[in-house]
Amino acid sequence: SEVEYRAEVGQNAYLPCFYTPAAPGNLVPVCWGKGACPVFECGNVVLRTDERDVNYWTSRYWLNGDFRKGDVSLTIENVTLADSGIYCCRIQIPGIMNDEKFNLKLVIKPAKVTPAPTRQRDFTAAFPRMLTTRGHGPAETQTLGSLPDINLTQISTLANELRDSRLANDLRDSGATIRIG
């Protein structure tokens, strides 16, 4: 029974995983892998940390939070449908059979062709200006009247990033968290 997380194609996906270090800087090795957690380590490792730093990573996978404070949540950049599946976060706490493992299910949805109303509201809340658009010639390139130097692609990306950051904060409360020591 994995906890399920969602993202759209082209977005950054966020998979939460946390622990509380016994003391500041007293880090615990962590691995992230694609596929359910096996008995040992992670299968198909995409990122790994030791007691000091990230010591192995692959492209598009990174730790956006402060892993030195125990935030080992995984960010997957620019996801595709192939990124769907189970991911394993394993916190390798020293001792006999002490490590904690969490299976998180990532569901990737196709990108929406047109922005949903909720996304428009999100952006309006972040930028409370009149969002009128005007066409420019046959190509119908659309820009915001009040922000003439920002195109819709940039706005959509910005809106996604804003939403991602809010989502990250929301998920922090529901993510896998353990306390050590």
Partner: antibody, heavy 125, light 108 residues
């Protein structure tokens, strides 16, 4: 070339102790988890213990044991000396076997990809 | 714990014949964590197949692996003398990791 060489086996009385060693070379030992697996004469393979990489200090390792050896065997490692250990106490006749150390590959195979040649342990009075 | 049952325990095959060894699990095993090892008398085991169907380095292409859930198999498309050995399946999907009892494959 990856090499694992076990030593320390021999004949021991029931209730006795023995410490096995596994010297590793040809790879960054501190970066890999390690296993001990045994094989009784003419029998199958029996996993007994695992220790995670503990890449900076051996005290940082996560350890797993088979129920059959829990409380009697202790797995440890010395990353500075590229050596894996298995301290065996309260030995029983059923512990008689060839003992192998094996590397746990996490980079692609997720398996015990290299094994030593083994060291023989005989528990008999 | 997951019990892996291999069959047959012993079998012999003529050169050129197709051989299939089976490994049955008492409960479901993730195909990513199902392996086969080859062992010859007096030698240590060698990783032969990993993640159900991937051949380890140096393993001849006549070998293949397949399966899912509780049923797995190793197949040799055309038996050769050097294939005579014991083959063990192994799972590390759930604790404790376990091995099958092995199949001893002999050449006729």
């Amino acid at each position: 070339e990856v090499q694992l060489v076990e030593s320390g086996g021999g004949l021991v009385r029931p209730g006795g102790s023995l410490k096995l060693s596994c010297a590793a070379s040809g790879f960054t030992f501190s970066d890999y988890g390690m296993h001990w697996v045994r094989q009784a004469p003419e029998k199958g393979l029996d996993w007994i213990a695992y220790i995670s990489s503990g890449s900076i200090s051996s005290g940082s390792s996560t350890i797993y044991y088979a129920d059959t050896v829990k409380g009697r065997f202790t797995i440890s490692r010395d990353n500075a000396k590229n050596t894996l250990f298995l301290q065996m106490t309260s030995l029983r006749s059923e512990d008689t076997a060839m003992y192998y150390c094996a590397r746990h590959d996490w980079r692609g195979l997720y398996a015990m990809d290299y094994w030593g040649q083994g060291t023989s342990v005989t528990v008999s009075s | 714990q997951i019990v892996l049952t291999q069959s047959p325990a012993i079998m012999s095959a003529s050169p050129g014949k197709k051989v299939t060894l089976t490994c049955s699990a008492s409960s479901s095993v993730s195909s990513s964590y199902l392996y086969w090892y080859q062992q010859k008398p007096g030698s240590s085991p060698k990783l032969w197949i990993y993640s159900t169907s991937n051949l380890a380095s140096g393993v001849p292409a006549r070998f293949s692996g397949s399966g899912s859930g509780t049923s797995y198999s190793l197949t040799i498309s055309s038996m050769e003398a050097e294939d005579a050995a014991s083959y063990f399946c192994h799972q590390s999907s759930s604790y404790p990791p376990t091995f099958g009892g092995g199949t001893k494959l002999e050449i006729k």
